[in-house]
């Protein structure tokens, strides 16, 4: 999820060359940027995270901090260095006047500065009346492996670790970084202070109401008795986890972040670093009935972001608000009236609701999956969580209309067996941020580092788009969609798959001169077609041209409109086989779909022809969806004819490897 998401503010403060006292100037041409929370009441002016460039050493961080203090003192300002970061991100946390920001932005090594802001527990209400514990049938829920090889870190409130439900399962670390409680008459009542964290620890690993009954947990206190914390406190907590991991490497680690604040570049960056160090992070999508991309850490792409549903698989309403939604949500999980340990007494249970509870469910499921398969990477785990989810059970009418297509209709579930899914070719759909409406606007969708981009498509609600293409960026393929003049903006949609030992490339055919249309195929030996994209420069793509039909018996070929350039994604991987499946409807139809059959995985989804009345194509689970303009506004019948083209693949290699293991 890009930095330009939502209302996130970026204030670029210009460098003034006349500023004194600089022994080293920043590299020429670079301007450090200042960021702050878009939600004004959550801002914490006076405390700033100064993030230094990636390769900055600890000694340089300390020197830069000292330099800031010295230069501030010369101007008569007091500053206090609260923390020097190293291990995750280089930088420091400083308490200072906002007047010093211009000065700080000019310091050597500075990448950006972010004003501190608040984060909040994501459960409502905190304490209901006590309720009796749930009753379980003897064999109702006896998972084969309770997550015993996995350690789950919980960044939350303090917790009552000797509650009967979690005693011996939770180690309270000595980490604490919380702000003062608001209000002069706030009374710290221990059971209230412990409420949120105790409940979540119970949901993850409780003896009787927990998901991963064998998982051990470690708690870090980053939320105060009112359930409020800071971005900086959370960052220092994440750094503590990284340092613990380095000092004493254990098995797989899951970090549960049942909190949310406004979009934070620095919090997302820290999550990215920790994820790339092999840690699985699970977070609450947020309880604001809003786009999760506007919140952190929910908007961090490397984090597994969880929305909340109820027992009827409907999105959870929380007072006037409810679960967040949108493309930054990975999946949903139970988050309404969830029974768990209550800090009111050592045997009490209580029900709480929210995306915190949903995230705790997924953290528990992740712990169980990792305990069964400790070598799973984050990408593999995320793909499995998506694969085993209940599909298409959420009533999407609850979401705002423009968010429905972006929000995954997935409710987390435990796999039927924690072993034996290795043969599957796993793919997921990743939507980009909206491009914006300018003529040359583009949107980019990216896969995770160890996923392969197997196809790329685009979608525009207005239908005014110029297609999409796969292109190399930083040594990896990305999916870029192009807006058209008068268009309200586009989305790029990447199909991201787990394909070990894959060698993929893009073959392009420029627009054809002849009327037969443009074609491109995979000509390398052993390469198979996994996806087709088309991109055009003209504003209105052949509104009255007849549709191009694929020649029979040429499965490795992409075909498209003669005015478009066509891009074929061609991959070679052990045992990979793919086939093209089409579903054409002669009459105008708002939506045409085609699905891959059991045992095959959808890797590519595109529309034939790519004419302007087609809004775009995208994959939903194993189904390719092609959307067209409202049929009432469509012209002739021939123009209304649309074909959905799915490319379905499977890996015989993965299937064989799985059988050999069994």
């Amino acid at each position: 999820q890009e930095d330009e998401d939502g209302d996130y503010e970026e204030l670029v403060l210009a460098l003034r060359s006349e500023e004194d006292g600089l022994a080293e100037a920043p590299e020429h041409g670079t301007t450090a940027t200042f960021h702050r929370c878009a939600k004004d009441p959550w801002r914490l002016p006076g405390t700033y995270v100064v993030v230094l460039k990636e390769e900055t050493h600890l000694s340089q961080s300390e020197r830069t901090a000292r330099r800031l203090q010295a230069q501030a003192a010369r101007r008569g300002y007091l500053t206090k260095i609260l923390h020097v970061f190293h291990g995750l991100l280089p930088g420091f946390l400083v308490k200072m006047s906002g007047d010093l920001l211009e000065l700080a932005l000019k310091l050597p090594h500075v990448d950006y500065i972010e004003e501190d802001s608040s984060v909040f527990a994501q459960s409502i209400p905190w304490n209901l009346e006590r309720i009796t514990p749930p009753r379980y049938r003897a064999d109702e829920y006896q998972p084969p492996d309770g997550g015993s090889l996995v350690e789950v870190y919980l960044l939350d409130t303090s917790i009552q670790s000797d509650h009967r439900e979690i005693e011996g399962r939770v180690m309270v670390t000595d980490f604490e970084n919380v702000p003062e409680e608001d209000g002069t008459r706030f009374h710290r009542q221990a059971s209230k202070c412990d409420s949120h964290g105790t409940h979540l620890a119970g949901v993850v690993s409780g003896r009787d109401a927990g998901v991963a009954k064998g998982a051990s947990m470690r708690s870090l206190r980053v939320l105060n008795c009112q359930g409020k914390g800071t971005v900086s406190g959370t960052l220092i907590g994440l750094e503590f986890i990284r340092k613990s991991q380095l000092v004493q490497p254990v098995g797989p680690l899951v970090v549960l972040l049942p909190l949310a604040g406004g979009y934070s570049r620095v919090l997302n960056a820290a999550c990215q670093r920790l994820a790339r160090a092999g840690v699985v992070l699970v977070t609450a999508a947020g309880n604001f009935r809003d786009d999760a991309c506007l919140y952190s850490p929910a908007s961090a792409p490397e984090v597994i972001t969880v929305g909340a549903t109820n027992a009827q698989d409907q999105p959870v309403t929380l007072g006037t608000l409810g679960t967040n939604f949108g493309r930054c949500v990975d999946l949903f999980a139970p988050g309404e009236d969830i029974i768990g340990a209550s800090s009111d007494c050592s045997t009490c249970f209580v029900s709480q609701s929210g995306t915190s509870q949903a995230a705790a469910h997924v953290a528990g499921i992740a712990a169980m999956m990792l305990s069964a398969e400790p070598e799973l990477t984050l990408a593999e785990l995320r793909q499995r969580l998506i694969h085993f989810s209940a599909k298409d059970v959420i009533n999407e009418a609850w979401f705002p209309e423009d968010q429905r297509v972006l929000t995954p209709n997935l409710v987390a579930a435990l796999p039927p067996s924690t072993h034996g899914a290795g043969w599957q070719l796993f793919c997921r759909t990743v939507w980009s941020a909206h491009s914006g409406p300018t003529r040359m606007a583009t949107a980019v969708a990216r896969c995770a580092p160890d996923e392969e981009l197997l196809s790329c498509s685009s979608f525009s609600r207005s239908g005014k788009r110029r297609g999409e293409r796969m292109e190399a960026q930083g040594g990896k393929l990305v999916c870029r969609a192009h807006n058209a003049f008068g268009g309200e903006g586009v989305y790029a949609i990447a199909r991201c798959c787990l394909l070990p030992q894959a060698n993929c490339s893009v073959h392009t055919a420029p627009p054809a001169e002849a009327s037969m249309g443009t074609r491109v195929h995979c000509h390398q030996q052993g390469h198979v077609l996994t996806g087709c994209s088309s991109h055009w420069e003209v504003e209105d793509l052949g509104t009255h041209k007849p549709p191009v039909l694929r020649p029979r018996g040429q499965p490795n070929q992409c075909v498209g409109h003669r005015e478009a350039s066509i891009h074929a994604s061609c991959c070679h991987a052990p045992g990979l086989e793919c086939k093209v499946k089409e579903h054409g409807i002669p009459a105008p139809q708002e939506q045409v779909t085609v699905a891959c059959e059991e045992g095959w995985t959808l890797t590519g989804c595109s529309a034939l022809p790519g004419t302007s009345h087609v809004l775009g194509a995208y994959a939903v689970d194993n189904t390719c969806v092609v959307r067209s303009r409202d049929v009432s506004t469509t012209g002739s019948t021939s123009e209304g004819a649309v074909t959905a083209v799915a490319i379905c693949c499977r890996s015989r290699h993965l299937a064989q490897a799985s059988q050999e293991l069994q």
Partner: antibody, heavy 115, light 109 residues
Framework: QIQLVQSGAEVKKPGASVKVSCKAS????????ISWVRQAPGQGLEWMGW????????NYAQKVQGSVTMTTDTSTSTVYMELRSLRSDDTAVYYC????????WGQGTTVTVSS | QSALTQPASVSGSPGQSITISCTGT?????????VSWYQQYPGKPPKLKIY???NRPSGVSNRFSGSKSGNTASLTISGLQAEDEADYFC?????????FGGGTKLTVL
């Protein structure tokens, strides 16, 4: 290693009080409470209650409610169980055990109530 | 009288398997995953053998196993040995407290 060490045997007259101590070591104390269990001669085990080493909260069995008080001294990692208004049927071996799971036990303290 | 019912005595020959039952209600054994089994030698404190229905603490022989069906929990000792002769107690959570069984004396013939 993980240990619970209890105070020595006590002989008390009916109506008196007794205070038994249990010193914990070898594990993070706040992760577990302490349960107290007694066993009358030739009889089974009876759970008396539990105290939190984290916040001092208690949970007493109905049968002994009103006559038992459990306390904790975090500075010495010691938990105490005081039984008041002793009667002859309070004669038993009193055990402290770690948490509700009672996975580690003290060696036991014999309390004899006799006139 | 104990809340959980156990047979007063059970016996078996060396090498045999025996099972001790522990019957409660849906408010204790049937309602929770937290049934434990303890072994006690005369004059000694009890020792945990099984926790959470079927889990063995480290160091406990795999000859000891636990299970539960409905409101009844069971302890099975296979390959009976002379040193298994002792008293065995089950325990379970209730909504607010803990309950023990009356105990079973195991005799190895």
């Amino acid at each position: 290693q993980i240990q619970l060490v209890q105070s020595g045997a006590e002989v008390k007259k009916p109506g008196a009080s007794v205070k038994v101590s249990c010193k914990a070591s070898g594990y993070p104390l706040t992760s577990y409470g302490i349960s107290w269990v007694r066993q009358a001669p030739g009889q089974g085990l009876e759970w008396m209650g539990w105290i939190s080493a984290y916040n001092g909260n208690t949970n007493y069995a109905q049968k002994v409610q009103g006559s038992v008080t459990m306390t904790t001294d975090t500075s010495t990692s010691t938990v105490y169980m005081e039984l008041r208004s002793l009667r002859s049927d309070d004669t038993a071996v009193y055990y402290c055990a770690r948490g509700y799971g009672m996975d580690v036990w003290g060696q036991g303290t014999t309390v004899t109530v006799s006139s | 009288q104990s809340a959980l019912t156990q047979p007063a005595s059970v016996s078996g020959s060396p090498g045999q398997s025996i099972t001790i039952s522990c019957t409660g209600t849906s408010s204790d054994v049937g309602g929770y995953n937290s049934v434990s089994w303890y072994q006690q030698y005369p004059g000694k404190p009890p020792k945990l053998k099984i926790y959470e229905v079927s889990n063995r603490p480290s160091g406990v022989s795999n000859r000891f196993s636990g299970s539960k069906s409905g409101n009844t929990a069971s302890l099975t000792i296979s390959g009976l040995q002379a040193e298994d002769e002792a008293d065995y107690f089950c325990s379970s959570y209730t909504s607010t407290s803990m309950v023990f069984g009356g105990g079973t004396k195991l005799t190895v013939l």
